[in-house]
């Protein structure tokens, strides 16, 4: 194959890959046809004056997870036709100017996980036709004016994982075509007015993982075409009354993990495109009538690991889509009875891990395709007559770690228990609570001294019991969860969450079995 | 250019397991779920479950809760679903694919993974 | 589990002509404004390929002759005009509980 060289393999269709540590300079000679060349977990540290000169056709090269601390300013001489080059993973601190000079054809710049410590102007000016500028995984703290300003036909530019404390409003500015940014993971605290006005056909940005505190109010009003919002993992404590307002094909935005401490009506939309959003891990206190009233199409909302203690009765006003609602680890202690009213379409609710102490007896009352209901690890004593009775599909119920008051009033929902005992599960029972001599006794079986009547146990509904966000493992049946820390660590701090006990959809989304797929 | 590229064939002993893996590229691999989906020859679909990178979350078709285990690593964005105490019923293509949101079609498949469980 | 019967098992219609099949489902899998039904393609060795989602959202990069209708229960995948790289087998799907597909329904031309 025009010689080979031996420490390299050569395919039929012009690919020359080079591997392995005893590689500690560019191989020779190349073969001249070559349009694809990989040198890759080499201990080459060093490219030298044009050691690719011969292979003036090679259109890809990847020089990657070597040793490469040092490269000559000419040592891309002569490729003119490259439309791809990677340097990731390697262990530049420096580049010199003028080593991309030449390259015209160039398309893609992968120079992510290094140790690049300042970029220049420069350093890209002769890369008009760069379409992708891979930065990531370095050690940029800034980047300055005009950096980019001759990639007009760049679409995809990534500067995440750096570390960055501030960009200036003007680095962006020539952009037009960008489609993707991403920031995160970065040392951001605030985002100048204007920086991202010119990027009118940006699609995803990505900013989640900083210490962004306030966000402009009109810093997404040029944006129109957004489609993917990345705002996790930050500080901010408020949301401008109009800063989601121009974003029309928005269909992911996530706000977890931020200091939110209220919303306010309207704040989303009109995004009729969203379907989830992540509310999760903030200080939100209450919710007021009408703040998701634009999210028509919204099917899951995750309001977990707040502080509600009010959710005004048209919070979920225009939630026509939602199916599923997590409310669990809040401080609620009272609902009012049309709070779910407009939620005709809801499966699942989670509301563990609050203070209810009592359900208004219409609470799910027009909600008749529940299929699952967290109520465990609350302050409620009894429940009103009837209140399930109409919930067809519930093949979820969930009533342990309840302070269930014992008494003759009880009767009614023990009765309603021992008829639907398959929709409790199997891993932790409701006990009673008081009075003291049957503290700790299950509510299903407790003797109250009055009279039962024998019943007969119908079948329930036979949707399988699929667990939802994550998997859980079974709670052993002597295990009460109602104190565990688990219960609100953060979802990030492990991965594989079905190994975990407790550690489970308890801990974000709350919902358990019957989940839609 | 999205792409979802599964492990090759196997052929497997009854009750020994199978790992099948599903290597992303051309998408944020974190930002959308991945379900699995068995088809049996000369059958139809079945979805046995999904995995949300984001968060590490799972979800299981009660059929295959106990046979079907989903992971991912996110560092390689590569999805895996391992099949264990494998019977001859479990002889099938296995595909990955691809959804937006939780509720949302399966917008890319894998080529398949054919596992054969014989004696 | 919501089962979804597709019909005819089989068709076989000339090439250019239209062909229709249908699938209806146990319970409703629709909202006011959404349908939680999808329709895939697939030859014979290939993955299933998404043409419809949501019941009559035409899938980027799907020919126009393909479109999904219906709601409720009853949904119909109409092929306007069928041509020759049509011939394959056509599952639909709902999310709207656990995912279920349809048993298929095996296209041929005449």
């Known amino acids: 194959y025009h010689g080979c060289p031996s420490e390299c393999t050569c395919s039929r269709a012009s690919q020359v890959e080079c591997t392995g540590a005893r590689i500690v300079a560019v191989p020779t000679p190349l073969p001249w046809n070559a349009m694809s060349l990989q040198i890759l977990n080499t201990h080459i540290t060093e490219l030298n004056e044009s050691p690719f000169l011969n292979i003036s056709a090679l259109i890809a090269l990847r020089i990657e997870k070597n040793e490469l601390s040092r490269i000559t300013p000419g040592a891309f001489r002569n490729l003119g036709s490259l439309r791809y080059l990677s340097l990731a993973n390697n262990k530049l601190q420096v580049l010199p100017i003028g080593l991309f000079q030449g390259l015209d054809s160039l398309e893609s710049l992968l120079l992510s996980s290094n140790q690049l410590l300042q970029i220049q102007p420069a350093h890209f000016s002769q890369c008009s036709n760069l379409k992708e500028l891979q930065l990531h995984g370095n050690h940029l703290e800034y980047i300055p004016d005009g950096a980019f300003d001759h990639l007009v036909g760049l679409t995809k530019l990534n500067l995440g994982k750096n570390s960055l404390t501030h960009i200036s409003p003007r680095v962006f500015q020539h952009l037009g075509n960008l489609q993707v940014l991403r920031l995160y993971e970065n040392r951001l605290t605030d985002i100048p007015m204007g920086t991202f006005d010119g990027l009118v056909n940006l699609q995803e940005l990505a900013l989640q993982q900083n210490q962004i505190g306030l966000l402009s109010p009109g810093l997404f009003h040029n944006n129109h075409n957004l489609q993917r919002l990345y705002l996790s993992n930050n500080h901010i404590s408020q949301l401008p009354p109009s800063v989601f307002m121009q974003l029309p094909q928005l269909n992911r935005l996530t706000l977890f993990g931020n200091s939110l401490k209220e919303l306010s009506p309207g704040i989303f939309g009109p995004m009729p495109n969203l379907r989830e959003l992540w509310l999760y891990d903030n200080h939100i206190s209450s919710l007021p009538d009408n703040v998701f009233s634009n999210l028509r199409q919204l099917q899951v909302l995750i309001l977990s690991r707040n502080q509600i203690s009010f959710i005004s009765p048209g919070a979920f006003n225009g939630l026509t889509e939602l199916r599923e609602l997590s409310l669990h680890t809040n401080a609620l202690q009272d609902l009012d009875g049309n709070v779910f009213r407009m939620l005709a379409n809801l499966q699942n609710i989670s509301l563990q891990n609050n203070r209810l102490r009592q359900l208004p007896g219409n609470i799910f009352a027009n909600v008749n395709g529940l299929m699952a209901i967290q109520l465990q690890n609350n302050q409620l004593e009894n429940l009103p007559l009837g209140i399930f009775d109409h919930l067809g599909k519930l093949c979820e119920l969930r009533l342990y770690d309840n302070p269930w008051r014992c008494d003759s009033d009880i009767l009614p929902l023990r009765n309603w228990l021992l008829l639907n005992q398959p929709r409790l599960g199997t891993d932790t029972v409701p006990v009673c609570f008081s009075p003291a001599n049957v503290r700790g006794q299950s509510l299903i079986i407790i003797n109250v001294n009055v009279a039962v009547p024998s019943v007969h146990v119908p079948e329930v509904p036979s949707y399988p019991e699929t667990p939802w966000y994550p998997d859980t493992p079974s709670y052993p049946d002597t295990t009460s969860v109602s104190s565990t820390t688990e219960l609100t660590s953060p979802v990030e701090d492990y991965t594989d969450l079905t190994t975990i006990q407790v550690t489970d959809d308890r801990s974000v989304w709350g919902m358990t079995q019957a989940q839609s797929g | 250019e999205v792409q979802l590229v599964q492990s090759g064939a196997e052929v497997k002993k009854p009750g020994s397991s199978v790992k099948v893996s599903c290597k992303a590229s051309?998408?944020?691999?974190?930002?959308?779920?991945i379900h699995w989906v068995k088809q049996a020859p000369g059958q139809g679909l079945e979805w046995i479950g999904l995995h949300y990178p984001y968060i590490g979350g799972t979800n299981y078709n009660q059929k295959f809760k106990g046979k079907a285990t989903l992971t991912v690593d996110t560092s390689t964005t590569t999805a895996y679903m391992e099949m264990s105490s494998l019977r001859s019923e479990d002889t099938a293509v296995y595909y990955c694919?691809?959804?937006?949101?939780?509720?949302?079609?399966?917008?890319?498949w894998g080529q398949g993974t054919t596992v054969t469980v014989s004696s | 589990d919501i089962v979804l019967t597709q019909s005819p098992d089989s068709l076989a219609v000339s090439l250019g002509e239209r062909a229709t099949i249908n699938c209806r489902a146990s319970?409703?899998?629709?909202?006011?404004?959404?349908?939680?039904m999808h329709w895939y393609q697939q030859k014979p060795g290939q993955p299933p390929k998404l043409l419809i989602k949501y019941a009559s959202s035409l899938e980027s990069g799907v020919p126009d002759r393909f479109s999904g209708s219906g709601s409720g229960t009853d949904f119909t995948l109409t092929i306007s005009s069928l041509q020759a790289e049509d011939v394959a087998v056509y599952y639909c799907?709902?999310?709207?509980?656990?995912?279920?597909f349809g048993g298929g329904t095996k296209v041929e031309i005449k």
């Open positions: 319970q409703s899998v629709s909202t006011s404004s959404y349908s939680y």
């Open positions: 694919a691809r959804g937006d949101n939780k509720y949302d079609a399966m917008d890319y």
């Open positions: 799907e709902q999310s709207w509980e656990i995912r279920t």
């Open positions: 051309g998408f944020t691999f974190t930002d959308y779920y």
